[in-house]
């Protein structure tokens, strides 16, 4: 807490400019008008303030807006955003995607901080759902964002937003998350033709049920083992040798390399040895 002191004569700041970097902390507190600071926030980023000076500026804004900053100020916080606590951010009402982008840019290249996580949470809750533009923005900054959400949070993703998802955005998703995302993807891509559909749905197949895998096996999709290994074990187990052979096409030879790993191992153990022998891979059930 900076002690309240009168501003020395001639030191009152008429605007936010570089001369303020020579002000001591108490002078900033006494001589910079909070309302002026709020209207000229966009200038703060261009001035090389010290961390201590930024603390003073934040304190002034906190006093001016005890209920939380307005979006006009938030949008221009720049590096001052790094000084905010999750508690500060919970008071905000951020509705503009441009504001969100501006703040994410400040944290770019770093891990998702608690501040950023709180900001995103506030933004998404304010919108009511994770729409395509938001998802596009978030995954561009944080490819692992989608997989950081709980299944409950993912349930608010509308099928239309699935078009914004890239395969790498799903890399760290677990089966419970894919269980939620797969039906949405199936709905989103339902009007595509066979081969195009498979390209789009492939990354989501970790949530596919047996009947959908059986249907895919009839479509000459040639699923690779990287995709097959990400399928749900309980969805793979009921598939016959013939169905797996059709599903994998030329990649069926890859079963040998994965014979000890799930779900291949469990599937092999469910098959008759005579059926496995038809593959000519030396698989032992």
């Amino acid at each position: 807490e900076v002690e309240k002191t009168a501003c020395p004569s001639g030191k009152k700041a008429p605007e936010i400019d570089e001369s303020l970097i020579f002000y001591k902390k108490w002078e900033l507190e006494a001589c910079v008008d909070a309302a002026l600071l709020a209207t000229q926030m966009d200038r703060v980023n261009a001035i090389p303030f010290t961390y201590e000076q930024l603390d003073v500026l934040k304190h002034k804004l906190d006093e001016l807006y005890p209920q939380g900053y307005p979006e006009s100020v938030i949008q221009h916080l720049g590096y001052l955003f790094l000084k905010m606590s999750p508690e500060d951010i919970r008071k905000w009402n951020v509705t503009s995607l441009e504001t969100l982008k501006a703040l994410l840019e400040v944290n770019k290249g770093h891990e998702m901080s608690p501040q950023v996580a709180t900001l995103i949470d506030r933004f998404v809750k304010g919108r009511g759902q994770l729409d395509k533009d938001t998802l596009d923005t978030l995954t561009a900054f944080y490819p692992g964002y989608l997989c950081s959400l709980s299944p409950e949070e993912l349930s608010s993703v509308p099928p239309s937003s699935i078009w914004a998802v890239r395969p790498q955005d799903l890399d760290t998703c677990d089966p419970r998350q894919l269980d939620v995302l797969y039906p949405k993807a199936r709905l989103a891509f339902q009007n595509m033709n066979g081969s195009e559909y498979f390209v789009k749905i492939q990354s989501f197949l970790g949530g596919a049920p047996t009947e959908d895998l059986k249907a895919l096996s009839q479509q000459n999709v040639s699923m690779d083992l990287a995709t097959f290994m990400k399928l749900r074990t309980d969805a793979v187990l009921p598939l016959t040798v013939a169905e797996v052979q059709k599903l994998l096409g030329p990649h069926v030879e890859g079963l040998k390399a994965e014979e000890r790993h799930r779900p291949v191992r469990d599937w092999i153990l469910r098959q008759r040895q005579d059926d496995l022998d038809t593959l000519g891979l030396g698989l032992q059930g």
Partner: antibody, heavy 119, light 108 residues
Framework: DVQLQQSGPELVEPGASVRIPCKAA????????VDWVKQSHGQSLEWIGD????????IYNQKFEGKATLTVDTSSSTAYMELRSLTSEDTAVYFC????????????WGQGTTLTVSS | QVVLTQSPAIMSASPGEKVTLTCGAS???????LYWYQQKPGSSPKLWIY???NLASGVPARFSGSGSGTSYSLTISSMEAEDAASYFC?????????FGGGTKVEIK
């Protein structure tokens, strides 16, 4: 450019444990198993086991069961091998290597971590 | 486990000479599960030949591989200085995966 980056040499006392990281870059981590191979005094190679990054399921050469534990952290695209109850017999170079799911053979290797067990 | 025996353990060859390395398996393998690696001192092994006879990317055409059942070989049709290295055969036909003891090829 595919890379498997291992940590530098380790000098460890008998009876201790060591954890060797193998950080992957340049490929989709979950599309490859990570295998570990031991090479004693520049001679033969021994397969220790492999780990699947999707299930974190590891398969071991029986000889190394209880000696090695293989794990992955998909969030950092890093595989780990922990070796415990170390003896002089564990002195060797340890390599991680990637193997594309559904394929045999190791198409990219780490530079190796030299482990010396000595008091 | 499948034991792979390589011979000779060490050999010397003159530039231009034909070199043949052998790898014998203690039990029959499916040939597509037999691979070869090259390793130079201080370096990691490199995939050299896969599925008995296919050259890995970047491997010179003077190398070839053949074999079936329990008997496999790697041949260098005309030895060059850069081929001096150790060569290991490797099987993944059955667990545990195993490697041969290696053949060290030196240049005369």
């Amino acid at each position: 450019d595919v890379q498997l980056q291992q940590s530098g040499p380790e000098l460890v006392e008998p009876g201790a444990s060591v954890r060797i990281p193998c950080k992957a870059a340049g490929h989709t981590f979950t599309d490859y198993n990570v295998d570990w191979v031991k090479q004693s005094h520049g001679q033969s190679l021994e397969w220790i086991g492999d780990v699947n990054p999707n299930t974190d399921g590891a398969i071991y050469n029986q000889k190394f069961e209880g000696k090695a534990t293989l794990t992955v952290d998909t969030s950092s695209s890093t595989a780990y091998m922990e070796l415990r109850s170390l003896t002089s017999e564990d002195t060797a170079v340890y390599f991680c290597a990637r193997r594309r799911l559904g394929q045999g053979g190791f198409d990219s290797w780490g530079q190796g971590t030299t482990l010396t067990v000595s008091s | 486990q499948v034991v792979l025996t390589q011979s000779p353990a060490i050999m010397s060859a003159s530039p231009g000479e034909k070199v043949t390395l052998t790898c014998g398996a203690s039990s029959s393998l499916i040939s597509k599960y037999l691979y070869w690696y090259q390793q130079k001192p201080g370096s990691s092994p490199k995939l050299w030949i896969y599925s008995t006879s296919n050259l890995a990317s970047g491997v010179p055409a003077r190398f070839s591989g053949s074999g079936s059942g329990t008997s496999y070989s790697l041949t260098i049709s005309s030895m060059e200085a850069e081929d001096a290295a150790s060569y290991f055969c490797h099987q993944w036909s059955s667990y545990p995966y195993t490697f041969g003891g290696g053949t060290k090829v030196e240049i005369k």
